[in-house]
């Protein structure tokens, strides 16, 4: 290839100069000149840069608010920012995680196709013809009817996706 | 104080090869290519190739190709050239040298700013 | 490849003299670099971008040029003067060098 049309990769140009960017946990002091080094500092406690960067603040971690139902998934270091997630029961509103919002229950007729996690929110579905929910539930799956046949009862009252069928004793033929 | 320190004199016998260190310090390594230049006996000095050590991208003098391997060890901030099928005409001094870019109104351009202190490499039977 | 052609190669001077070196492109190039070694020694950069002299460099050394013709200037010679320059550029791939030029006592 021939000579660059810019700067090299981990470079950047200030004042006619291609200078050295920051490496990710640091921040820039003083940029490099055509007889010094780029001087760069490493970022302070609860702090961090994650790119090649010529930032002379550091961003500050994330905090996890416990008012808004976070906590701490992931320390952050000088390189990475805190990762926060949801308490128990409760889910992220976004993907930047900022505040949190307590699990979908699935209603009576529906059940749950993927349980919620910190970052996602229950999942339901409707109870399909030979299952049921009678519950209003963030756990319970659709359960399926009970089978009469198998305990040599008959069906007295049919299921719906929201109750289970009645099983009764068979009639005895009367001679 | 950016400084290339290269590693010590070599006597090599024809049809081997031989691997020259340079280790860097005082700036940020992988951010600056880094080069190799030989110098033979009273001679001029004549580019071998290059290396950018933040991915080991690199360019060969069409001379030296299929002859010559540049690398570098990041973890220890260390540039190696390594010649092979050694000939007596690869008697010289090897040297390493940083890379420097700048822009000047127009055309980004590039030269030496530090160099190491050689490396003697003899050719002999 | 672009050759660099230096003249002379060999420079015999007494100190005070004006010495003049030229660097000759087999194509235009943007800019000229120069780089001064003494034996037993690596090169230093010594004048960069035509013109600009690198840190510590002496006010009697200068440099000028353009298209296929540089020159390295030096008003006075002063007996640390005294070793081979070089001229290189980076213009075109790959990078390439002058063939040096001795400047010795006279």
């Known amino acids: 290839p021939e000579p660059p049309t810019a700067c090299r990769e981990k470079q950047y140009l200030i004042n006619s100069q291609c200078c050295s960017l920051c490496q990710p946990g640091q921040k820039l002091v003083s940029d490099c000149t055509e007889f010094t080094e780029t001087e760069c500092l490493p970022c302070g406690e609860s702090e961090f840069l994650d790119t090649w960067n010529r930032e002379t603040h550091c961003h500050q971690h994330k905090y996890c608010d416990p008012n808004l139902g976070l906590r701490v998934q992931q320390k952050g270091t000088s390189e990475t920012d805190t990762i926060c997630t949801c308490e128990e029961g409760w889910h992220c509103t976004s993907e930047a995680c900022e505040s949190c919002v307590l699990h979908r229950s699935c209603s009576p007729g529906f059940g749950v196709k993927q349980i919620a996690t910190g970052v996602s929110d229950t999942i339901c579905e409707p109870c399909p013809v030979g299952f049921f929910s009678n519950v209003s539930s963030a756990f319970e799956k659709c359960h399926p009817w009970t089978s009469c046949e198998t305990k040599d009862l008959v069906v007295q009252q049919a299921g719906t996706n929201k109750t289970d069928v009645v099983c009764g004793p068979q009639d005895r033929l009367r001679a | 104080e950016v400084q290339l320190v290269q590693s010590g004199a070599e006597v090599k016998k024809p049809g081997s090869s031989v691997k020259v260190s340079c280790k860097a310090s005082?700036?940020?390594?992988?951010?600056?290519?880094m080069h190799w230049v030989r110098q033979a006996p009273g001679q001029g000095l004549e580019w071998i190739g290059n290396?950018?050590?933040?991915?080991?991208?690199?360019h060969y003098a069409q001379k030296f190709q299929g002859r010559v391997t540049i690398t570098v060890d990041k973890s220890t901030s260390t540039a190696y050239m390594e010649l092979s099928s050694l000939r007596s005409e690869d008697t010289a001094v090897y040297y390493c040298?940083?890379?420097?870019?700048?822009?000047?109104?127009?055309?980004?351009?590039?030269?030496?700013?530090?160099w190491g202190q050689g490396t003697t490499v003899t050719v002999s039977s | 490849d672009i050759q660099l052609t230096q003249s002379p190669s060999f420079l015999s001077a007494s100190v005070g003299d004006r010495v003049t070196i030229t660097c000759s492109a087999s194509?235009?190039?943007?800019?000229m670099h120069w780089y001064q070694q003494k034996p037993g020694k690596s090169p230093k950069r010594w004048i960069y971008?035509?013109?600009k002299l690198a840190s510590g460099v002496p006010s009697r050394f200068s440099g000028s040029g353009s298209g296929t013709e540089y020159t390295l200037t030096i008003s006075s010679l002063q007996p640390e003067d005294f070793a081979t320059y070089y001229c290189q550029q980076w213009s075109s791939n790959p990078w390439t060098f002058g063939g040096g030029t001795k400047v010795e006592i006279k």
């Open positions: 040298a940083r890379e420097r870019i700048y822009y000047s109104g127009s055309t980004y351009d590039g030269y030496f700013d530090v």
């Open positions: 290396i950018d050590p933040s991915n080991g991208e690199t």
């Open positions: 971008d035509t013109s």
């Open positions: 005082g700036y940020t390594f992988t951010s600056y290519w």
């Open positions: 194509s235009s190039l943007s800019y």
